[in-house]
């Protein structure tokens, strides 16, 4: 009879075991375990009748189609075999064990005690057959195995071979190299590769296979396994396989498809090809005069580009447009995209205008081309070049005028200060009684007219000031203070200020420069009670052009001592000699009490102590501070007066021979102007040099003569 066993392990014993088995007995045990397992059988006890070639009693172990072993007897002899310690392994998941005893037993035989168990098959080790083994990696587990692939590969649906995804390769460059995947290593199995070469219309693709060419083939049938096919439009070239590379292929097309197919077996190295685009040739090129063509080639074909550039100092000229380079291209019809341009010498064109300066050409015919030279100079004697640079500019290869120091920046012409076009005379009579100043003697002299139109009727007054630069006037703070205030200091509105420069005769303002104010800056500490810090600045709306009648005065060095006692200084003004005259009369110049023509006076600086004492002795609260100095004569007769306020008290600096503003007309005693022992009091400008520069927003060294050094 037959016993079916399906467990993963078990015990099989001869009938009647451990007693002797009966005669004429036959039992078959069929053991089945799951796929991926095999059966291991071994005997713990074995005692059967001996016979030649186990003819009588035996245990036979077999599979479906193969006897694995036949055992009998008690011990192994030449003609019979006992299992002993031997293990029987089934090749598969099935094992059949048959026990047979014949009709007679001379002795008593105890039979056998056998055990079986399912053992895992290591398919990864045992599968030698290429058709069954994993292509790349094999992973065993109890009862089975699975395959996986190297990076970049995909497991085929057969779960065994590794293919690549290579159906989306686009080549658009004019040259390139295409290979089978992993070349020169064996190409993957079960793959369908598609390579597209897609170039611009007008190119023709040439294919050239290289030496190594190894695609699985067949001796009789052409390329049944793996192959390359080349598709050009409707035409298909190939299939190609084997070890001999195809000859070079001129496709005559700009669009080519390369198909590569591999089946699930074989180990071949694959292939490599290079492709090159060919196109129509264009005519030979001649570089322009003073120019060159890059790259320089014997032949140029479709899509080749050349760059035309010019020698240093020349520019490419194309359709009247200047450029650094010009590119042309060989077209598919074999013509160039454009004509070769010309190279034109760089032209810096007319040099930029220099404010307060002029330009002269060093090169003949006023040439402005490459390497030409020009020279900038300032309008002397009114302006001087900053940093004393040469002013020579050369036309550079970039088409800009260049100076060794300043580069492409223009030089700066700064006003000269304290040098009137007309020398000041040494002997001067008093203002009162009248000494006319010749035009140009005091080119810094400014008439400041204030008309406060915010009041009805308008308030109107005037004072003097001194030009410090093209845009700034120095004056006394009290001139620019709103008049209808008792103790508070509020500047007048800039809209109410007009400044006249180059004015000689107030009856004739036509020759003067009049300017409105952009800013009015009073010293923040100006004190209306004692006129301490009586200094202010007016910034003009527009810079004024300098000339013989309009030139700045120099600022002094920063020195608290101020001008030395007994030094002589000059003050100019259109001051009033009759204190009862009204401002309307002054400004309209309708009365002779105002001096129509600018007057000036020469006054000595009074020792500080003497002046202080002279004012302290009077009734009234007069204070001569360290920010003031006095000038005038003990006996009187010469003085500044109303309307001269804010005017400059100038002293000639011995070292620089420039006129320096040491004082500003500030105040005087209660008596009439020019009275005995009534000295004029002046703001000591040297105490305010830093403040002035700070307001004007420029460092001391900026103006050549801005401050005497």
């Amino acid at each position: 009879h037959t016993v079916e066993l399906n467990d993963m392990f078990g015990q099989i014993q001869s009938p009647g075991y451990p007693d002797s088995y009966p005669s004429d007995s036959e039992v078959t045990w069929n053991i089945t375990v799951p796929d991926g397992f095999r059966i291991k059988l071994y005997f713990m006890h074995f005692n059967l009748e001996s016979s030649y070639l186990c003819e009588y009693d035996y245990v036979k172990v077999e599979t479906e189609d193969q006897v694995l072993a036949t055992f009998c007897g008690r011990e192994t002899t030449d003609t019979e075999q006992t299992p002993g310690q031997e293990v029987v392994l089934s090749p598969g998941s099935f094992m059949s064990i048959t026990f047979r005893s014949d009709f007679s037993n001379e002795e008593r035989f105890t039979g056998f005690d056998a055990h079986y168990m399912a053992v895992d098959v290591d398919e990864c080790k045992e599968r030698e057959d290429e058709e069954l083994s994993c292509d790349h990696y094999c992973h065993n587990y109890i009862g089975g195995y699975y395959c996986s692939c190297r990076f970049g590969y995909i497991l085929h649906t057969d779960n065994r071979t590794c293919r690549v995804e290579c159906s989306d390769n686009l080549f658009t460059q004019r040259t390139g190299v295409i290979t089978s995947p992993d070349f020169p290593n064996p190409y993957p199995k079960s793959s369908e590769c598609l390579y597209t070469i897609e170039l611009e219309e007008g190119f023709m693709v040439n294919l050239q296979f290289e030496d190594i060419f190894d695609i699985e083939d067949h001796p009789e049938v052409p390329c049944p396994y793996d192959y390359i096919k080349i598709k050009v439009g409707p035409k298909v070239l190939g299939p190609f396989c084997g070890e001999k590379a195809p000859e070079p292929i001129n496709t005559q097309s700009h669009s080519v498809l390369i198909l590569f197919h591999s089946d699930n077996s074989g180990e071949n190295r694959g292939w490599r090809l290079s492709y090159r685009a060919a196109g129509n040739e264009c005519p030979e090129l001649q570089p322009p005069v003073h120019g060159k063509i890059e790259p320089s080639q014997a032949k140029y074909s479709f899509k080749d580009q050349v760059l035309i550039s010019c020698d240093t100092g020349y520019k490419v000229l194309k359709d009247n447009v200047e450029m650094d380079t010009f590119q042309i291209e060989c077209l598919k019809d074999g013509t160039w995209s454009n004509k070769i341009p010309t190279c034109k010498i760089v032209d810096c064109r007319a040099p930029g205008e220099l404010e307060h300066g002029l330009v002269t050409f060093s090169t003949r015919n006023n040439l402005t081309t490459y390497k030409s030279e020009i020279r900038y100079s300032c309008q002397e004697p009114y302006y001087k070049m900053l940093n004393n640079i040469t002013g020579i500019y050369t036309c550079s290869a970039q088409g800009v005028w260049m100076n060794k120091v300043l580069g492409r920046s223009l030089p700066t012409c700064l006003p000269e200060c304290g040098q009137p076009s007309r020398s000041l005379p040494s002997l001067v009579k008093r203002i009162i009684g009248g000494r006319n100043a010749e035009p140009g003697l005091f080119p810094w002299q400014a008439l400041i007219v204030v008309e406060d139109t915010s009041r009805v009727p308008n308030d109107k007054w005037f004072g003097s000031g001194a030009l410090l630069s093209e845009s700034w006037i120095l004056t006394a703070a009290h001139v620019l203070r709103s008049q209808r205030r008792d103790t508070t200091v509020i500047p007048v509105s800039k809209e109410h200020v007009t400044v006249y420069l180059g004015l000689h005769d107030v009856r004739d303002k036509s020759g003067a420069v009049n300017s409105s104010a952009a800013r009015v800056v009073l010293h923040p500490d100006f004190n209306i009670q004692n006129y301490n810090h009586d200094i202010a600045l007016v910034q003009l709306q527009e810079p004024v052009p300098l000339g013989p009648h309009v030139m700045p005065v120099c600022l002094p060095r920063l020195e608290p001592e101020g001008p030395s006692p007994h030094m002589l200084g000059l003050v100019a003004g259109w001051g009033i000699s009759n204190p009862n005259v009204t401002v309307d009369e002054i400004i309209s110049s309708g009365t002779r009490t105002l001096s129509d023509v600018l007057q000036y006076v020469k006054l000595p600086v009074v020792p500080h102590a003497e002046c202080k004492t002279s004012y302290e002795s009077r009734s009234g609260n007069y204070s001569v501070t360290e920010n003031m100095f006095c000038a005038g004569y003990y006996e009187g007769g010469k003085d500044t007066c109303l309307g001269d306020s804010g005017g400059a008290f100038v002293i000639l600096d011995d070292l620089s021979q420039r006129w320096v503003v040491q004082g500003l007309v500030s105040w005087g005693g209660p008596e009439e102007c020019g009275s005995k022992q009534v000295y004029g009091v002046y703001t000591k400008v040297s105490n305010y040099v830093d403040w002035v520069w700070e307001q004007m927003g420029s460092p001391q060294g900026r103006a050549p003569g801005g401050t005497v050094s």
């Epitope: 139109t453 915010s454 009041r455 009805v456 009727p457 308030d459 109107k460 007054w461 004072g463 009290h478 001139v479 008049q483 209808r484 205030r485 008792d486 508070t488 509105s493 204190p579 009862n580 005259v581 009204t582 401002v583 109303l642 306020s645």
Partner: antibody, heavy 113, light 112 residues
Framework: QVQLVQSGAEVKKPGASVKVSCKAS????????IEWVRQAPGQGLEWIGE????????DYNERFKDRATFTADTSTSTAYMELSSLRSEDTAVYYC??????WGQGTLVTVSS | DIVLTQSPDSLAVSLGERATINCKSS????????????LAWFQQKPGQSPKLLIY???TRESGVPDRFSGSGSGTDFTLTISSLQAEDVAVYYC????????FGGGTKVEIK
């Protein structure tokens, strides 16, 4: 013609605020000071302060500095005076004046509980 | 602040006669820079707004009859009506124009 037209009479309770307007016409409003002056019934004139509409600059009589506020709307050429924390002694006619020469018709402000 | 003291408080003058009003300042009103005395005179008729008569102490406003005149300098100022007319009945005020501006107490002019 050149004129200043003020807003109508107001009656206010003590502690409240009042805002009087003054519309200018016939001249450049931004360029001239507008003064505010008041006159209590049967009394003399008292200067409150002034504003320059173009710049917004103001000057106040110390007596009114904490309670009076001057503003100007240049788009409508109108000046305003607001007086806060009103008391009965603020009952007066309030005038706006173009820098002395031109006076508005006056606005009577009555403060009464 | 500058104080202006007007005198007399009231004045009764016959038609055609001269009327004189004084105004005294606690501070000098003459500005040496503009050469002006910042003092003005106003007329206020009953139920009306004040009207400018004189500015800068002596300059007559346009449209003001020439019987009105101003004089003085520094601290003492005078308004004169040379020949009083019926329409001149009013209260007259002086005003100084240094900030803060101040008014005199007023002088009432009536017909005798």
């Amino acid at each position: 013609q050149v004129q200043l037209v003020q807003s109508g009479a107001e009656v206010k309770k003590p502690g409240a605020s009042v805002k009087v307007s003054c519309k200018a016409s016939g001249y450049t409003f931004t360029g001239k000071w507008i003064e505010w002056v008041r006159q209590a019934p049967g009394q003399g004139l008292e200067w409150i302060g002034e504003i320059l509409p173009g710049s917004g600059s103001t000057d106040y009589n110390e007596r009114f500095k904490d309670r009076a506020t001057f503003t100007a709307d240049t788009s409508t050429s109108t000046a305003y005076m607001e007086l806060s924390s009103l008391r009965s002694e603020d009952t007066a006619v309030y005038y706006c004046v173009r820098s002395e020469d031109l006076w508005g018709q006056g606005t009577l402000v009555t403060v009464s509980s | 602040d500058i104080v202006l003291t007007q005198s007399p408080d009231s004045l009764a003058v016959s038609l055609g006669e001269r009327a004189t009003i004084n105004c005294k300042s606690s501070q000098n009103l003459f500005n040496s820079r503009t050469r002006k005395n910042y003092l003005a005179w106003f007329q206020q008729k009953p139920g009306q707004s004040p009207k400018l008569l004189i500015y800068w102490a002596s300059t007559r406003e346009s449209g003001v009859p020439d019987r009105f005149s101003g004089s003085g300098s520094g601290t003492d100022f005078t308004l004169t009506i040379s020949s009083l007319q019926a329409e001149d009945v009013a209260v007259y005020y002086c005003k100084q124009s240094y900030i803060p501006f101040t008014f005199g107490g007023g002088t009432k002019v009536e017909i005798k």
